[in-house]
Interface confidence: low
């Protein structure tokens, strides 16, 4: 029976010292990675392609340059820093902000003006990917050209100027229905975030050929939900201290508990020239002992464990977070493929 | 000692029947999820916001519509189908295809023509997100306007026409350096993929004001890597049979092995109106017994286990794949946030 044979093996190997069994784990992991890569790329064998052919076929072109350049950015150097990606807290992707009351009376020429937007301190100017101001234009009676102008309120200048232009656009409207129009305000928003005191609000105008303003700025009856608003897309990669996570050890460690150990896979070392990038990557592996409730996989696991004693012969040292690698490779058919291979890097080990 | 107390607890609870401890697991999981959501969104308490205020504040606008509409698509119904996302094989994101020999002699007016592109059957027309033809334009000596024309070869028509236009563009070039120019060919590529027999190749022209062709189609000496090529971005969501994965059970199951059980979290049921979408989601949980090497987490784990017996008191039933949920919610500051909360859905359970 294969299973009992395996268990016997395990018992025999249990006599090895820590260094020996770590070495075994390491070489097994490298072999496993080679098998996985071919299997995950659905290749039966490694493509047979020479360095010369590669040099000849590789386009010297922007999209390829971009793909190769990404490898400088994407190396797994998280073990070197004290901060790591926070995969516990929510990541914010889009923030929709409604106009709000300004801290001062936002009136110009005796009339209230729209709009003033307050921003959460959470939004950092360098994290803004896209910022769109959405305005609703009321329907028109006849086909017409509409001149949309977004002005930024500024502190009055010597000549009395209260505004500076942000964006203006011209659009054709057909009768029958109002439309939502979006305007790029990323630069303005970034400036406001850098210098909050410069955010005095904006004015929106959308004049048709007869000078009528079609922009809904102060919604009338039946116009609920047609206020202007800001849609801000942000990249949110929160960090948190690595102390919140699993242990990291090095090859010389005497740590007996469950730990992540470094392991670099070098494709050139085993002659895989068909992989264009990366030439090597940090795969890592897990090794060590587990005590009950030591380093749970998810923050609430202890609750589940308390209620779920059966089937818990004791937790095991296993990857609790794995990440993919991006790979640029020849598939042996004069095609260069850029793809993502899942679960190739051990980011964290834990007892679960 | 807290640990021994916990172990004692575990032994007492071990006497419960399967249904009771599953029920305990389930209620613990719901409470844990509530705590997690607030904690992951960095909220101390649930925002106090009424349905009326929500109705009043929600913009009736395209970006919000899109975000809400996503919830129809994103429901976790994977348990209902026999195919599930394949998170083992590589996903292809970009394919760079070089011109190749046509199956027939691609000559027009006695001259060889560029270019013919062969496509892997792997590319499905409806998975193409972007397709760009990249051409390299040789440097010019003086500032000039270049007329780029991409023609598609077709079966000769009655009037002898051999071409139909795909794209034409006009661009200004300054002396000193050649440039890479990209042209959108998504529609043509999709047609070729739908009807491969219509793919007879293309002709590329890039004429300056004097009628000289600046496009590198057949690279001369020193022009290695300057061939035209196609850059195709695809969405690749390979599927594989759920049999390759962990077990799925229902509430009435008598399965004792490690299994995933359904659990729906209903935000409305506990009065969380501040969550705009989803109103409910399938969270699921893991429960059951583990035998050695039953349902390993990653395909190569058995190799590592053989070499790593220490600290493996036996594997445990734990989530081996978790996924995030996207959430649209009010943060209590007149802002609507669309974000991703990690590790909120148990997709698969296994012994690891």
């Amino acid at each position: 029976n294969e299973n009992s044979e395996q268990k016997e093996n395990v018992e025999k190997e249990g006599l090895c010292n820590a260094c020996t069994w770590r070495q075994n784990t390491k070489s097994s992991r490298i072999e496993a990675i080679k098998i996985q890569i071919l299997s995950k790329l659905r290749l039966e064998t490694a493509p047979n392609i020479s360095k010369d052919v590669i040099r000849q076929l590789l386009p010297k072109a922007p999209p390829l340059r971009e793909l190769i350049d990404q490898y400088d950015v994407q190396r797994d150097d998280s073990s070197d820093g004290s901060l790591e990606d926070d995969d516990y807290h929510a990541t914010t992707e889009t923030i929709i902000t409604m106009p709000t009351e300004s801290d001062f009376l936002m009136q110009v020429d005796g009339k209230p003006k729209c709009c003033f937007f307050k921003f959460s301190s959470k939004i950092q100017y360098n994290k803004v990917v896209k910022a769109q101001l959405w305005i609703y234009l009321r329907p028109v009676e006849t086909p017409t050209t509409v001149f949309v102008q977004i002005l930024r309120l500024i502190k009055p200048m010597k000549d009395g100027t209260r505004y500076t232009g942000i964006r203006s656009l011209k659009l054709d409207m057909n009768p029958g229905t109002g439309i939502w129009q979006s305007i790029d305000v990323k630069t303005v928003l970034q400036n406001w975030l850098k210098q909050p005191e410069s955010n005095l609000g904006i004015e929106i105008k959308a004049l048709d050929e007869n000078g009528h303003d079609l922009a809904v700025t102060f919604p009338g009856p039946g116009e609920d939900g047609l206020n202007p608003f800001l849609e801000v897309k942000v990249t949110d990669t929160p960090k948190r201290s690595r102390r919140d996570f699993g242990l990291d050890c090095d090859e010389h460690s005497t740590e007996s508990r469950c730990c992540r150990y470094p392991l670099t896979v070098d494709f050139e070392a085993f002659g895989w020239d068909w992989i264009i990038a990366p030439k090597r990557y940090k795969a890592n592996y897990c090794s060590g002992e587990c005590e009950f409730v030591f380093l749970q996989k998810y923050p609430h696991t202890h609750l589940v464990h308390q209620a779920n004693p059966r089937g818990s012969a004791g937790p095991c040292c296993t990857p609790t977070k794995m990440s993919p690698i991006n790979m640029l490779y020849f598939n042996g058919k004069e095609q260069i493929i850029y793809g993502k291979i899942p679960a190739m890097v051990v980011d964290r080990c834990g007892c679960s | 000692n807290e640990n021994s107390e916990q172990k004692e607890n575990v032994e007492k609870e071990g006497l419960c029947n399967a249904c009771t401890w599953r029920q305990n697991t389930k209620s613990s999981r719901i409470e844990a999820i509530k705590i997690q959501i607030l904690s992951k969104l960095r909220l101390e308490t649930a925002p106090n916001i009424s349905k009326d205020v929500i109705r009043q504040l929600l913009p009736k606008a395209p970006p919000l519509r899109e975000l809400i509409d996503q919830y129809d698509v994103q429901r976790d119904d994977s348990s209902d189908g026999s195919l599930e996302d394949d998170d083992y094989h590589a996903t292809t994101e970009t394919i760079i295809t070089m011109p190749t020999e046509s199956d027939f002699l691609m000559q027009v007016d006695g001259k060889p023509k560029c270019c013919f592109f062969k496509f892997s059957s792997k590319i499905q027309y409806n998975k193409v997100v972007k397709a760009q033809l990249w051409i390299y334009l040789r440097p010019v000596e003086t500032p000039t306007t270049v007329f780029v024309q991409i023609l598609r070869l077709i079966k000769p028509m009655k009037d002898g026409t051999r071409y139909t236009g795909i794209r034409s563009l006009k661009l200004d070039m300054n002396p000193g350096t050649g440039i890479w120019q990209s042209i959108d060919v998504k529609t043509v590529l999709q047609n070729w993929l739908k009807q491969p027999e219509s793919n007879l190749g293309i002709e590329i022209k890039a004429l300056d004001e004097n009628g000289h062709d600046l496009a590198v189609t057949f690279p001369g000496p020193g022009e290695d890597g300057l061939n035209p090529f196609l850059e195709v971005k695809v969405t690749d969501t390979p599927k594989r049979s759920r049999r390759d994965f962990g077990l799925d059970c229902d509430e009435h199951s008598t399965e004792s092995r490690c299994c995933r059980y359904p659990l729906t979290v209903d935000f409305e049921a506990f009065g969380w109106d501040w969550i705009i979408a989803p109103k409910r989601y399938k969270a699921n949980y893991c429960s059951g017994e583990c035998e050695f090497v039953f349902l390993q987490k990653y395909p190569h784990t058995h190799l590592v286990h053989q070499a790593n017996p220490r600290g493996s008191a036996g594997p445990c039933c734990t989530p081996t794949k978790m996924s995030p949920i996207n959430m649209l919610y009010f943060n209590g500051k007149e802002q609507i946030i669309y974000g991703k909360i990690p590790a909120m859905v148990v997709d698969r359970c296994g012994c690891s």
Epitope: R138, P139, G176, G222 | -
Partner: antibody
Framework: QVTLKESGPVLVKPTETLTLTCTVS????????ISWVRQAPGKGLEWVGI???????YKASWAKGRLTISKDTSKNQVVLTMTNMDPVDTATYYC?????????????WGQGTLVTVSS | DIVMTQSPATLSLSPGERATLSCTSS????????LSWFQQKPGQPPKLLIY???TLAYGVPSRFSGSGSGTDFTLTISSLQPEDAATYYC??????????FGQGTKVEIK
């Protein structure tokens, strides 16, 4: 409270002109389209016409030449006038907020008024 | 002229059953989604159920859902309730101020 109410004659003779009024409350006609829809007894709904918030008029093809729609924003009223009435025009006439088929138009209707065309 | 055809003319089902009503337009509605569904009970004005082909109107129970785009649309009532006995109309918009209703489907509860 937002309401729409149709009013006008209950009986009209053939060839005569029908005038119906839709009086709204809680609605600003300068920001709202108003539609007219009719329904013959035991039959389905039939679109008649629209006056847009800005005063543009759109009419069903069968009603062109016979139908006039106007509004008096200050009185909160929309008026439908249909000439050359025929017994086939016997129907319940409704006014509705917005345009049924566009966005959430048709989310509010009057109770309708039954108009009989008979000599 | 635009023709909107609803089928079936009458649908007779028991409580708890799933009802599927169809609406086909002779030409594509504007933006592929200018289509609404209305419910009408005798002696009452129509009530908006679905707009933009698939968006549930405010206050409408979630057992109602809409799907489709272009020329073919469906209204589904996942689990019929006695109060769902009514006539259901689709309404399409075609741009340029052109609108049309279907002839209606009567839903009866057995």
């Amino acid at each position: 409270q937002v309401t729409l109410k149709e009013s006008g004659p209950v009986l009209v003779k053939p060839t005569e002109t029908l005038t119906l009024t839709c009086t709204v409350s809680g609605i600003d006609l300068s920001h709202t389209d108003i539609s007219w829809v009719r329904q013959a007894p035991g039959k389905g709904l039939e679109w008649v016409g629209i006056i847009s918030y800005a005063g543009s008029k759109y009419k069903a093809s069968w009603a062109k030449g016979r139908l006039t729609i106007s509004k008096d924003t200050s009185k909160n009223q929309v008026v439908l006038t249909m000439t050359n009435m025929d017994p086939v025009d016997t129907a319940t006439y409704y006014c509705a907020r917005g345009v049924p088929a566009y966005s959430h138009g048709g989310d509010l209707w009057g109770q309708g008024t039954l108009v009989t065309v008979s000599s | 002229d635009i023709v909107m055809t609803q089928s079936p003319a009458t649908l007779s089902l028991s409580p708890g059953e799933r009802a599927t009503l169809s609406c086909t337009s002779s030409q594509s509605v504007y933006h592929a989604n200018w289509l609404s569904w209305f419910q009408q009970k005798p002696g009452q004005p129509p009530k908006l159920l679905i707009y933009w082909a698939s968006t549930l109107a405010y206050g409408v129970p979630s057992r109602f859902s809409g799907s489709g785009s272009g020329t073919d649309f469906t209204l589904t009532i996942s689990s019929l309730q006695p109060e769902d006995a009514a006539t259901y109309y689709c309404a399409g918009g075609y741009g340029g101020g052109r609108y049309a209703f279907g002839q209606g489907t009567k839903v009866e509860i057995k």
